[in-house]
Interface confidence: low
Amino acid sequence: ITQQDLAPQQRVAPQQKRSSPSEGLCPPGHHISEDGRDCISCKYGQDYSTHWNDLLFCLRCTRCDSGEVELSPCTTTRNTVCQCEEGTFREEDSPEMCRKCRTGCPRGMVKVGDCTPWSDIECVHKE
């Protein structure tokens, strides 16, 4: 799931920490104010920014889908890391969903690789 273009649905709370931009950019974990004068901290667990930036809003944290486990939570400088549940995997071609791993190999083939969160079981032809 990529949410890099999404911004939070809430406005900046007045109590959030502010500092001054350096050369027009704000550090990771912050976004810039509309007048470009302040850097405002992202809200822990709600939004984040990973790079020096001039974003007007921090990026909204990804929420892991059902069928995924949260490996690490969202911080102000890093998005949530989600991983497919045991027995499922995410294909490069269809990263939007976890697919069930096959339970076994077709006849005439042997298993050489287990199901992982990023790959199905691997089968090769018997010698």
């Epitope: 273009d5 999404l6 911004a7 509309e34 007048d35 470009g36 790079h51 930036n53 809003f57």
Partner: antibody, heavy 121, light 118 residues
């Protein structure tokens, strides 16, 4: 299927007003930011205005600030552009475009066919 | 000087690969921006092609074939759109977009007219 259909364009005299509408269908309108982008005859694209998903935050290009007002009615799945004090240089095809996000990014993933506004005496 | 510079016109033969350039003014740093590309065929509205931030952070527009790909050269402050296996229907105007510093206002490049030579 995402569809954006603009209407309300036409011929207007300098100093006059016009209200453009954009009817949206095929997606949950109330969860997306929206934009107006214009293109003068034979020219490039010029961003005009943007509005976030709820309508609470509105942004304008310097060239239209104080003259144009962007608004939306989420109950009617409609986006509007009220254009006042029109000038000859506002003559263009006006496109309604959907933002990829709830707020406003540079990712305008769906566009309408456009409506032509001509400002001339 | 505009924030984004695109060459006005480029051409290449059918079936070849071409790379379109979008140069960000040097008081900005392309390293912190995504580069967006739009295609506009004559008589049609613009169409979103792709967004490129890095190899691991990019997105393709709806129904946009993988012949269209993005890249960035941070040292040269440039974004690129590569189109492989050029087809007649690729003849169009191509616009890039990036964020202007501390502003949500949307800045488009001036566009590059691509001609596909047969």
């Amino acid at each position: 299927e995402v569809q954006l259909v603009e209407s309300g364009g036409g011929l207007v005299k300098p100093g006059g007003s016009l209200r453009l509408s954009c009817a949206a269908s095929g997606f949950t309108f109330s969860t997306y930011g929206m934009h107006w982008v214009r293109q003068a005859p034979g020219k490039g694209l010029e961003w005009v205005a943007g509005i976030n998903y709820s309508g609470n935050n509105k942004y304008y290009a310097d060239s239209v600030k104080g003259r144009f007002t962007i608004s939306r009615d989420n109950a009617k799945n409609s986006l509007y552009l009220q254009m006042n004090s029109l000038r000859a240089e506002d003559t263009a095809v006006y496109y309604c475009a959907r933002d990829h996000s709830t707020w406003l990014s540079r990712h305008l993933d769906y566009w309408g066919q456009g409506t032509l506004v001509t400002v001339s005496s | 000087q505009p924030v984004l510079h695109q060459p006005p016109a480029m051409s290449s033969a059918l079936g070849t690969t071409i790379r379109l350039t979008c140069t960000l003014r040097n008081d900005h740093d392309i390293g912190v921006y995504s580069v967006y590309w739009y295609q506009q065929r004559p008589g049609h509205p613009p169409r979103f092609l792709l967004r490129y931030f890095s190899q691991s952070d990019k997105s393709q527009g709806p129904q946009v074939p993988p012949r269209f790909s993005g890249s960035k050269d941070v040292a040269r402050n440039r974004g690129y759109l590569s189109i492989s296996e050029l087809q007649p229907e690729d003849e169009a105007m191509y616009y890039c977009a990036m964020g202007a510093r501390s502003s949500v206002t949307h800045v488009f490049g001036s566009g590059t007219q691509l001609t596909v030579l047969s």
